[in-house]
């Protein structure tokens, strides 16, 4: 006897099949407990963490994770070689750069080794799950007497693959000005007042040319330009988290 259940999932491109098996109907005393959902994120295309909520298991269970790519020469699942643990119980898997193929469907299987029939398979599009590192090396230069240019770098990811959110403000501003910059790691401010002190910071996301990631990176370290006069109201100038 077998049943195929389509689990609800967060991504319309993610499908999870829960396969239940048993030898005969009379042995079906209780339904098989569903497995936790696996969440994967690719960090800056350097490594990927696939994690699950191990505390959702009624008993401490070392679930195992196997994965493969839908279109590949080797169609067999391979087991995780680097498990992550929470309270000495498996709660995730770290997959290294060599094993990441962004543009092939990633098939991940979570299994209870004590009950091999208890397993769930999910299919993920990794290009939609990339979280970049915070932009680095923010540098400011004068293009003219009143025009300022901000540039930054993103490690390991092609700049054209990223969308950026720039925040800036002066010590006289009550709030940040925010701009979306697409695919070019630079931004120019046409008019600055040299009597003011400006602060800039940037974050990025892997969107929309190379993938459709919805998650933004952390903020860069802020950079400052201009007069080093004491701020009139420091509380207004505090960086929001």
């Amino acid at each position: 006897w077998s049943s195929k259940v389509l689990m609800s999932s967060a991504n319309e491109d993610i499908k999870a099949d829960l396969i239940l098996t048993s030898t005969a109907p009379e042995h079906l005393s209780a339904p098989t407990l569903p497995l936790p959902e696996v969440q994967c994120f690719v960090f800056n295309i350097e490594y990927m963490n696939c994690t699950w909520n191990s505390s959702s298991e009624p008993q401490a269970t070392n679930l195992t994770l196997h994965y493969r790519y839908k279109v590949s020469d080797n169609n067999t699942f391979q087991e995780c070689s680097h498990y992550l643990f929470s309270k000495e119980i498996t709660s995730g898997c770290q997959i290294q750069k060599e094993d990441i193929q962004l543009y092939q469907t990633f098939v991940v299987q979570l299994q209870d080794p004590q009950k091999p029939q208890r397993r769930a398979v999910q299919k993920l599009n990794l290009q939609n799950l990339v979280i970049p590192r915070a932009p680095e090396n923010l540098t400011l230069s004068n293009l003219s007497e009143s025009q300022l240019e901000l540039r930054w770098k993103s490690r390991h990811i092609k700049e054209r693959c990223l969308q950026y959110l720039v925040q800036y403000r002066s010590n006289r501003d009550r709030s940040w000005t925010e701009l979306i910059v697409n695919h070019e790691p630079r931004f120019s401010l046409p008019s600055v007042d040299e009597l003011k002190r400006y602060t800039f910071r940037v974050r990025s996301r892997y969107n929309p040319i190379c993938g459709s990631s919805q998650q933004w990176s952390k903020w860069s370290q802020p950079v400052h330009w201009g007069s080093h006069t004491v701020e009139e109201n420091p509380s207004l100038f505090a960086l929001e988290a």
Partner: nanobody
């Protein structure tokens, strides 16, 4: 995985209406504030509206009295009803989420003005063009 998908954008004449929808999956509304952000043609970003746990939605001054934000928890949807549209409402509208913010006060003046950068997850956006 958290997933936000906007729909409902389009071309509309000044004075017209549109209703934007956002399909939400991968997390519970209880833990999140939902917002609508707007990228104008000059690429500036601003928060149009936020719906929070205290049922006291935030609206940018430029849309107060014209736009209404709502959510349907059963369907995991967030909506932005936009009436009396103006050319300056033109832009890309993003559905976005952030962790629930503490409720400071019913008096809006005591709350920090929300920023696009407060929202860590955005959808792909839907284009709204208001033009005759």
């Amino acid at each position: 995985q958290v997933q936000l998908q906007e729909s409902g954008g389009g071309l509309v004449q000044p004075g017209g209406s549109l209703r934007l929808s956002c399909t939400v999956s991968g997390f519970t509304f209880d833990e999140s504030d939902m917002g609508w952000l707007r990228q104008n043609p000059g690429n500036e970003c601003g928060v149009v509206s936020v719906i929070t746990s205290d049922d006291n939605p935030y609206y940018d001054d430029s849309v107060k009295g014209r736009f209404t934000i709502s959510e349907d928890n059963a369907k995991n949807m967030v909506y932005l009803q936009m009436n009396s549209l103006k050319p300056e409402d033109t832009g890309v509208y993003y559905c976005a989420t952030r962790s629930r913010q503490p409720v400071y006060s019913r008096d809006y003046e005591l709350r920090p003005r929300p920023l696009c950068g407060d929202f860590g997850v955005w959808g792909q956006g839907t284009q709204v063009t208001v033009s005759s």
